[in-house]
């Protein structure tokens, strides 16, 4: 291990389609992956009208737009679907938007999905 | 190093059936998930099949549910595709290929592929 | 199913010269997207996922960039061994799909 940087060996586990895909719909997912490779947790959602949809949640692959990152923060203006990473076991637990090019309050405090 | 080695393709007859190994090694096999994808002659990349590191969840293409089943087994690192009821359009070179999750399914390693031809 | 077009089918290209190759996402698809390299008679080999990302091995002439619907492939300096066609793929949801592929050909 490298010191000074947190290893992922799990993640929150979501998936808005669990029926169709035939999956677990929430749970603990075990980040699997290269020795050499960095892990990371993600999450990606929606806002329709206000409301948080979550779509996934889970473990990441190597990723440098995910390292050193403790906190599951989405940046981008406006997407259309929302995504985060951060390393740290269940870091993905919350996740939360701000934007980084606007200058007003966040539009939506961290976000935990509902069990 | 990764090494994927499909087997098991041939020539068949509408109808008939056909069931594709692929070998891995190199790899903790039973930690990863696993995807066939296909090409047809002069064609571009057509995706199967996908089924998780332990076998529990699988998914399918429209144009295969149905006829095809993929199954792994992890004590001999091998995944397998049942490939039934075959048609002329099921003509392709088969890749199995690794994806680290079921979500983030970027196949980083591909077998050589082996050749079904369906025709009477 | 979300359909996945790359730009241009084909193109001619000089050693040295800066390619780029389009693909657009039938919906926002956020970073779940993936390219491949595949030369005749050979499997197709991962080049660059999530969108950003180099995969192992390949040189840093490769890169990605976009994220929602629009995504880009670009070569900084064709090299010999570039010559290819290349797809993208969708991983946000199932099934996988694939662009139909942009073959860069010597000119």
């Known amino acids: 291990a490298i010191l000074g940087r947190s290893e992922t060996q799990e993640c929150l586990f979501f998936n808005a389609n669990w029926e169709r895909d035939r999956t677990n719909q929430t749970g603990v997912e075990p980040c699997y992956g290269d020795k050499d490779k960095r892990r990371h947790c993600f999450a990606t959602w929606k806002n329709i009208s206000g409301s948080i949809e979550i779509v996934k949640q889970g473990c990441w692959l190597d990723d440098i737009n995910c390292y050193d990152r403790t906190d599951c923060i989405e940046k981008k203006d406006s997407p259309e679907v929302y995504f985060c990473c951060c390393e740290g076991n269940m870091c993905n637990e919350k996740f939360s938007y701000f934007p980084e090019m606007e200058v007003t309050q966040p539009t939506s405090n961290p976000v935990t999905p509902k069990p | 190093e990764v090494q994927l080695l499909e087997s098991g393709g041939g020539l068949v007859q509408p109808g008939g059936s056909l069931r594709l190994s692929c070998a891995a090694s190199?790899?903790?096999?039973?930690?990863?998930?696993m995807n066939w994808v296909r090409q047809a002659p002069g064609k571009g990349l057509e995706w199967v099949s996908g089924?998780?590191?332990?076998?529990?969840?699988?998914s399918y293409a429209d144009s295969v549910k149905g006829r095809f089943t993929i199954s792994r087994d992890n004590s001999k690192n091998t995944l397998y595709l049942q490939m039934n009821s075959l048609r002329a359009e099921d003509t392709a070179v088969y890749y199995c290929?690794?994806?680290?999750?079921?979500?983030?399914?970027?196949?980083?390693?591909w077998g050589q592929g082996t050749l079904v031809t369906v025709s009477s | 199913d979300i359909q996945m077009t790359q730009s241009p089918s084909s193109l001619s290209a000089s050693v040295g010269d800066r390619v780029t190759i389009t693909c657009r996402a039938s919906?926002?698809?956020?970073?779940?997207l993936n390219w491949y390299q595949q030369k005749p008679g050979k499997a197709p080999k991962l080049v660059i996922y999530?969108?950003?990302s180099l995969a192992s091995g390949v040189p840093s002439r490769f890169s990605g960039s976009g994220s929602g619907t629009d995504f880009t492939l670009t070569i900084s300096s064709l090299q010999p061994e570039d010559f290819a066609t290349y797809y993208c793929?969708?991983?946000?949801?199932?099934?996988?799909?694939f662009g139909g592929g942009t073959k860069v050909e010597i000119k």
């Open positions: 793929q969708q991983s946000y949801d199932n099934p996988l799909t």
């Open positions: 999530a969108a950003t």
């Open positions: 290929a690794r994806a680290a999750n079921w979500h983030d399914t970027a196949l980083d390693y």
């Open positions: 089924i998780n590191y332990n076998g529990g969840y699988t």
């Open positions: 190199g790899f903790t096999f039973s930690d990863y998930g």
């Open positions: 919906q926002s698809i956020s970073r779940y």
